[in-house]
C-alpha cells in the first residue's frame, strides 16, 4: 500500500512551488496532451553558461514515513538538438531534500539541502522526436531515509540541461491491514529494521473466537520494506465451538460440535446424543447412554451391556466349567469383560455365603474376555450358585447389574476313610470305605504311599477293592499314606495323608521317627 | 490326668540366652512328642519346635525360622524338657507355652505327627530389653 | 512353606452362627485342629481331625474340611465365644507344624 505524501501531477498546478533565483529558470507551464492540461516546470537556458536554477517543493508534512520514495516523471532535451551543441549544456539536473519541523516559507537556503542523486535520464529527446511532438519520457524513483522531521522539502537543481518535470510523486509504504489465518495483522509502515534485517515482525491478533491453539506459536508477519507481506509463522484456529467460513469463526450449528481448537469443521452430534445447541462443544447423552472418561467425544454415547447369554454349569466331580455367551446387546462398545462371583449353600442349614476364598479358577474372575471358565476345589454335599455379570466401559457410572445365574450341587466322592489293618516289619494292610450310595461311581483306587521325611519319591498302586497291602517296606519305619478314588469324571477326594508303621525287627511296636 | 508346669528367667538382655523348662506330671512321658510354642504380644502362635526321647536317643524337629537359635532337650529321669534360645533380640519378646500333643506319636502303627495340643503350660512372659 | 489364611476378624450377632475359614493348599488331605485363645490365657483345643470335639467342648463347636479351605462353625454364638480361634496342621512335606495367624471372632450388641 502506497499513502502519497506529495503529487504534483495531481494538483493541477496549484501547488506554487519555489523558484531561485525568482522570475529566472524555472517555471510553470501549462500544455494540452489528449485534451487535458498538464502542468509542468522546465527549465532550458542552455545556451548562457553557469546556470543555477532551484526549484524547491512546499513543505510536506512526513506523516508518519519514515523512508520515503520520490518518483519523477521528466523529459530531457538532447544537447545536440540546439545550435552548435550548446556548449554549456547539460543532460542531467540534481534532486535534494530538507528536513525540519517548520515550514521555512519564502525562506529559502540552500545550505539546508543535503544532495540525494543526480538525475539522468534514460531517453533524451532528440530534434527529430520534438518536431514531432513525440517526447521521451522518463520515470526515475529514489528513497530518502530514515527521516525524523516533521517535515521535508524537495530541491530540484538545474545546472543548465532542457528539462521538463511532469509529475512529483512522494509515497512512503505500507504494508496493509491483513487477515491471514484467521489473524488479523493492522497496517504496518514498511520499515527496515536494520541493514541486516531487512524485515518488521508484526504480531497478529486472533479473529473472535479464534485462538493460539495449546503450546503452538503466536501468528506473526513479517513487513518488507517494499510494503509487501511475508512468510506467515504460527497460527490462529477455531475455538471449541466454532468452525472457520472463509476469514471468520463461526459458530457451530444446532446438532453440531466441535470440542477443541482445531482446523477440522464443526462434526454432526453422534448417535444416542440430545441435539446440541448452537456453539456447543459437545452433545450430551441420552438418558440411558453414557460416555467413559476415556470415550472421544466424537463417539457415539453407549450403555451398560445386557447379561451374558446362555449361562450352562456343567459339573466334573469336584469342578465345575462355566460357558456362556456374549451379551445380546453390547451397549454399543466392544470393550466388554466378564466377572464371576461365587456363593456356597449349606444343604442341611440352609445358609448361604460366598466361597471367592475356597475355590480355584482356571483365570482370574474378575475382568474375564473369555466366556469360559474352570472352577475346582468344590466341596461335596454342597450347592454353588455361580453369577456371570457383563461389564463394558460404562458399567462403573451405573448401579444396577447385568449378569445371569446359574446353580450346581456338588455329588463328589466323600474323602475315603483309611485305616490300618495289619502289618508286619516289610508291610503294611491298608483298608478303606466309603458311602455305599457312592460306591458304584467309583472306578478304582489310588493308593500312594512314600517313607517320611522323604519327601522326593514315592511310589502309587492302583486298587478295584477296598485293601491293599503295601510290602517290601523297611523295617520301623513310618510311611505317609493316602487313597484315592477315582471316578469316570476324574479324581474323586483324597483321603487324609496317614502315618503307618511298620514293626521293628525285634517284633517290638516300638515307634519309628 | 497329665499336668504342665513351667518356669525359667522372665527378663532378659539383647545377646542373651533364654532358657525355659517345662515339668510334666503324669502320664507316660517317653510317648509323646513335647512342644514350646510362643505367641508375641498381640500376635498369633507360632511353633518353636518338639521333642521325643525313646531308649537313650532325643528326636529333635524345629523351626526351620528359628532353628539356628533352639535347642530343645530332655531330662528323662526328671520328667522335664526345655527350651533355649541363644543370642535373643527384642523380636524373642513373647509368652511362650510348653504342650503336650491329644494322642502318643504312634500307637499299634498308626502315628500322628503334629497332632493337636490338648494340654499347654501356664505360659512365661519373657521380655528382651536393653 | 506351607501358609494357613485365616481372616483377620468375623463379627456375628448373638445367636447367630459363625463361620471362622482357614486356607491352604489341600488342606483337606490334611487333619486340621482348632484352638480358642481369650486374653491372658492358653489356647484351648475345641476341634481336632476337622470336625472332633475334645470331651468337655460344647457341641455347638463343629469343623469341616474339604479341597483348600477349613471351616470352624460356631453355632448359636454368645458373647462367651468372643475370642481369638486359631487353626493347626501338621505339613507332611516339611515335617513342621503350622498355625494359622488368628481371627478375632466379636460378638454383636
Known amino acids: 500500500k502506497e499513502v502519497v505524501l506529495l503529487d504534483f501531477a495531481a494538483m493541477k498546478g496549484e501547488l506554487g512551488w519555489l523558484t531561485h533565483p525568482y522570475g529566472k529558470g524555472w517555471d510553470l507551464m501549462q500544455n494540452i496532451m489528449d485534451d487535458m492540461p498538464i502542468y509542468m516546470y522546465s527549465v532550458c537556458n542552455v545556451v548562457s553558461g553557469d546556470q543555477d536554477n532551484w526549484l524547491r517543493t512546499n513543505w510536506v508534512y512526513r506523516e508518519e514515513a519514515e523512508r520515503i520514495f520520490i518518483e519523477l516523471k521528466f523529459t530531457v532535451r538532447d544537447c545536440n538538438s540546439f545550435p552548435g551543441g550548446a556548449s554549456s549544456c547539460k543532460e542531467t539536473f540534481n534532486l535534494y531534500y530538507a528536513e525540519s519541523d517548520v515550514d521555512y516559507g519564502t525562506n529559502f537556503q540552500k545550505r539546508q539541502f543535503t544532495k540525494i542523486d543526480t538525475i539522468a535520464p534514460d531517453e533524451i529527446t532528440v530534434s527529430s522526436d520534438f518536431e514531432a511532438r513525440n517526447v521521451k519520457l522518463n520515470v526515475e524513483e529514489r528513497m530518502v531515509g530514515p527521516l525524523t522531521r516533521k517535515g521535508f522539502y524537495l530541491a530540484f537543481q538545474d545546472i543548465g540541461a532542457c528539462v521538463a518535470l511532469l509529475s512529483v510523486r512522494v509515497y512512503y509504504k505500507k504494508c496493509p491491514e491483513m487477515l491471514q489465518s484467521l489473524a488479523r495483522f493492522p497496517e504496518t509502515i514498511a520499515v527496515a529494521v536494520s541493514d541486516t534485517q531487512p524485515l518488521a515482525t508484526v504480531a497478529g491478533t486472533c479473529v473472535d473466537h479464534a485462538v493460539v491453539p495449546y503450546g503452538g506459536e503466536g501468528p506473526l508477519m513479517h513487513c518488507t520494506v517494499d510494503g509487501e507481506w511475508l512468510v506467515p509463522i504460527g497460527q490462529c484456529l477455531c475455538q471449541e465451538g466454532y468452525e472457520k467460513v472463509e476469514d471468520a469463526c463461526r459458530a457451530c450449528s444446532p446438532g453440531f460440535f466441535k470440542s477443541e481448537a482445531s482446523e477440522s469443521p464443526c462434526l454432526e452430534c453422534p448417535e444416542h446424543t440430545l441435539p446440541s445447541t448452537e456453539g456447543a462443544t459437545s452433545c450430551q447423552c441420552e438418558e440411558g447412554y453414557f460416555r467413559a472418561p476415556e470415550d472421544p467425544l466424537s463417539m457415539s454415547c453407549t450403555r451398560p451391556p445386557s447379561a451374558p447369554n446362555y449361562l450352562t454349569a456343567i459339573g466334573m466331580g469336584a469342578k465345575v466349567e462355566l460357558r456362556w455367551t456374549a451379551p445380546k446387546d453390547t451397549g454399543g462398545r466392544q470393550d466388554i469383560v466378564y466377572s464371576v462371583t461365587c456363593e456356597q449353600c449349606w444343604p442341611e442349614s440352609g445358609e448361604c455365603g460366598p466361597c471367592e476364598a475356597s475355590v480355584r479358577y482356571s483365570e482370574p474372575p474378575h475382568a474375564l474376555t473369555r466366556t469360559s471358565v474352570t472352577v475346582s476345589d468344590l466341596e461335596p454335599h454342597m450347592n454353588y450358585t455361580f453369577a456371570v455379570e457383563a461389564r463394558n466401559g460404562v458399567s462403573g457410572l451405573v448401579t444396577s447389574r447385568s449378569f445371569r445365574t446359574a446353580s450346581v450341587s456338588i455329588n463328589q466322592t466323600e474323602p475315603p476313610k483309611v485305616r490300618l489293618e495289619d502289618r508286619s516289619t516289610t508291610s503294611l494292610s491298608v483298608t478303606w470305605s466309603i458311602p455305599v450310595s457312592q460306591q458304584s461311581r467309583v472306578w478304582k483306587y489310588e493308593v500312594t504311599y512314600r517313607k517320611k521325611g522323604d519327601a522326593n519319591s514315592y511310589n502309587v498302586r492302583r486298587t478295584e477293592g477296598f485293601s491293599v497291602t503295601l510290602d517290601d517296606l523297611a523295617p520301623d519305619t513310618t510311611y505317609l499314606v493316602q487313597v484315592q478314588a477315582l471316578t469316570q469324571e476324574g479324581q474323586g477326594a483324597g483321603s487324609k495323608v496317614h502315618e503307618f508303621q511298620t514293626l521293628s525287627t525285634e517284633g517290638s511296636a516300638n515307634m519309628a521317627v | 490326668q497329665v499336668q504342665l508346669q513351667q518356669w525359667g528367667a522372665g527378663l532378659l538382655k539383647p545377646s542373651e540366652t533364654l532358657s525355659l523348662t517345662c515339668a510334666v506330671y503324669g502320664g507316660s512321658f517317653s510317648d509323646y512328642y513335647w512342644s514350646w510354642i510362643r505367641q508375641p504380644p498381640g500376635k498369633g502362635l507360632e511353633w518353636i519346635g518338639e521333642?521325643?526321647?525313646?531308649?537313650?536317643?532325643?528326636?529333635?524337629n524345629y523351626n526351620p525360622s528359628l532353628k539356628s537359635r533352639v535347642t530343645i532337650s530332655v531330662d528323662p529321669s526328671k520328667n522335664q524338657f526345655s527350651l533355649k534360645l541363644t543370642s535373643v533380640t527384642a523380636a524373642d519378646t513373647a509368652v511362650y507355652y510348653c504342650?503336650?500333643?491329644?494322642?502318643?506319636?504312634?500307637?499299634?502303627?498308626?502315628?500322628?505327627?503334629?497332632?493337636?495340643?490338648?494340654?499347654w503350660g501356664q505360659g512365661t512372659m519373657v521380655t528382651v530389653a536393653s | 512353606s506351607y501358609v494357613l489364611t485365616q481372616p483377620p476378624s468375623v463379627s456375628v450377632a448373638p445367636g447367630q452362627t459363625a463361620r471362622i475359614t482357614c486356607g491352604g493348599n489341600n488342606i483337606g488331605s490334611k487333619n486340621v485342629h482348632w484352638y480358642q485363645q481369650k486374653p491372658g490365657q492358653a489356647p484351648v483345643l475345641v476341634v481336632y481331625?476337622?470336625?472332633d470335639r475334645p470331651s468337655g467342648i460344647p457341641e455347638q463347636f463343629s469343623g469341616s474340611n474339604s479341597g483348600n479351605t477349613a471351616t470352624l462353625t460356631i453355632s448359636r454364638v454368645e458373647a462367651g465365644d468372643e475370642a481369638d480361634y486359631y487353626c493347626?496342621?501338621?505339613?507332611?512335606?516339611?515335617?513342621?507344624?503350622?498355625f494359622g495367624g488368628g481371627t478375632k471372632l466379636t460378638v454383636l450388641g
Open positions: 504342650a503336650k500333643p491329644l494322642r502318643p506319636h504312634c500307637t499299634n502303627g498308626v502315628c500322628y505327627s503334629g497332632d493337636a495340643f490338648d494340654i
Open positions: 481331625d476337622d470336625s
Open positions: 521333642v521325643n526321647h525313646r531308649g537313650s536317643i532325643n528326636y529333635n
Open positions: 493347626q496342621v501338621w505339613d507332611s512335606s516339611s515335617d513342621h507344624l503350622v
